[in-house]
Amino acid sequence: FPQDRPFEDTCHGNPSHYYDKAVRRCCYRCPMGLFPTQQCPQRPTDCRKQCEPDYYLDEADRCTACVTCSRDDLVEKTPCAWNSSRVCECRPGMFCSTSAVNSCARCFFHSVCPAGMIVKFPGTAQKNTVCEPASPGVSPACASPENCKEPSSGTIPQAKPTPVSPATSSASTMPVRGGTRLAQEAASKLTRAPDSPSSVGRPSSDPGLSPTQPCPEGSGDCRKQCEPDYYLDEAGRCTACVSCSRDDLVEKTPCAWNSSRTCECRPGMICATSATNSCARCVPYPICAAETVTKPQDMAEKDTTFEAPPLGTQPDCNPTPENGEAPASTSPTQSLLVDSQASKTLPIPTSAPVALSSTGKPVLDAG
């Protein structure tokens, strides 16, 4: 294209710039060791240091290892990005008992209130269940099987103790486990038809939460009430709905009483790393560049295998998008790339403040 020559020539005399034919303009040449943040950098601020995979550029311009979520009790909340660490959180049904930078140093299962106590606040990702003494005369809120019996006067304090510190919380102490009989009963009751005789007029014996009021006679609406932005999972636990607050996510289905909010990648992006009810990493949708497709697998599996697409086929894409928009990601199995879990490193049990970097090297952790 001879008409491009004048533009190209303007770059030649300037060693700090080069001509990019694809975008037909002069671009700033990033110095050695720095990499462009966009296709055609225009100024020095468009260049940055490139860190190794699983490292991010911290505020002091140092490459720092992203935390790993390789412990059994952790899940990835946000992925490792060029300028921010991976963030881990406790997996559903657990709460963070000791926080750590971008992670949690210890998760515990939400507790069930013992006999004579009822749920005051359900457990969240940050806090354990908070229990309070059951008030006498109220229909039993069976937080445990013993609560379904008429309480003996010695087991339930009549007055709540005055806390010495306003910040304290009486958290309960019996962990919820998904496989308990009560939890299964809770889940089955939630799916029963409202007119089912076994669900009518029965006090809830769900672990963890009591109805907000005793069940009205003949009413099937006796389900546990979770806080806003929480849903009742299959084990009868109040579990935080996922958040779609990341820029690359949009809400697909809202947070309901018995199901989580689900998120999907915003239009023009596709899910590269799936997560429960969401996507851990969205990438720009390829314009017919993909040569591989994912082989659908059981979602519970950690790794996704890749195979070449059948001859003569291409993944859904638009070679010449008319409106400039690509279809949004719908299913995690459409992912083009799936990050496999960071390999589990050997534990370094120690009393020193140590965390494991993704490379297996111990790094000092503020805890």
Epitope: R71, R106, S111, S169, A171, T173, M174, P175, K344, G367
Partner: antibody, heavy 125, light 111 residues
């Protein structure tokens, strides 16, 4: 030198209340999780509960045997830990220990590395 | 709650010999390669002293004759060679979940 000294024990009637204190020195109290553990005469140790540090919201956890009756609080400015015991029963008679827990491991492993000498509580009419 | 069963309740060991104390949990206290079991020594009239954390990690200042092992539900404290000053009651404690619990204790006598 790390020191933990419990006080406030004594004789109390069933249904009564008592507040135990644990004065500490020799370490940065505000950084630590703090536990209460008791031991009835000639019997085993029983964990009662702990209070987290400021970074973790000063929240507490309790064993089922004392939940709703006992509360734990702390005063970081004075480096003192408290155990408020209400609705006391005969079975609460024991030596009460405070113990610190360093939340520095990742994972935090919840072990008690320093203990006080204990204070004796007797619940009897 | 997780119940910790210690055995034997008491044992007498000759000076210089090996003492082995067992602690069995009613369910696993291990996760992600970490074993949330700790061992304490309590001498008569004194508070407990932490000997071992995370099943096998010796606390600083604790003699190397103390060692711990185990994972899942079965844990062991070994003392070898036993010395006179080791006459104490030993307790295991788990922190695998809330609430934490202690074992019933093992009293060690030196013959």
């Amino acid at each position: 030198e790390v020191k933990l000294v419990e006080s406030g024990g004594g004789l109390v009637q069933p249904g009564g209340s008592l507040r135990l204190s644990c004065a500490t020195s020799g370490f940065t109290f505000s950084d630590y999780y703090m536990n209460w553990v008791r031991q009835p005469p000639g019997k085993a140790l029983e964990w009662l509960g702990f209070i987290r540090n400021k970074a973790n919201g000063y929240t507490t956890e309790f064993s089922a045997s004392v939940m709703g009756r006992f509360t734990i609080s702390r005063d970081d400015s004075q480096s003192i830990l408290y155990l408020q015991m209400n609705t006391l029963r005969a079975e609460d008679s024991a030596t009460y220990y405070c113990a610190r827990d360093p939340p520095y491991g990742n994972p935090h492993y919840y072990a008690m590395d320093y203990w006080g000498q204990g204070t004796s509580v007797t619940v009897s009419s | 709650d997780i119940v910790l069963t210690q055995s034997p309740a008491s044992l007498a060991v000759s000076l210089g010999q090996r003492a082995t104390i067992s602690c069995r949990a009613s369910k696993s206290v291990s996760a992600s390669g970490y074993n949330y079991m700790h061992w304490y020594q309590q001498k008569a009239g004194q508070p407990p002293k932490l000997l071992i954390h995370l099943a096998s990690n010796l606390e600083s200042g604790v003699p190397a004759r103390f060692s711990g092992s185990g994972s899942g539900t079965d844990f062991t404290l070994n003392i070898h060679p036993v010395e006179e000053e080791d006459a104490s009651t030993y307790y295991c404690q788990h922190s695998g979940e809330l609430p934490f619990t202690f074992g019933s204790g093992t009293k060690l006598e030196i013959k």
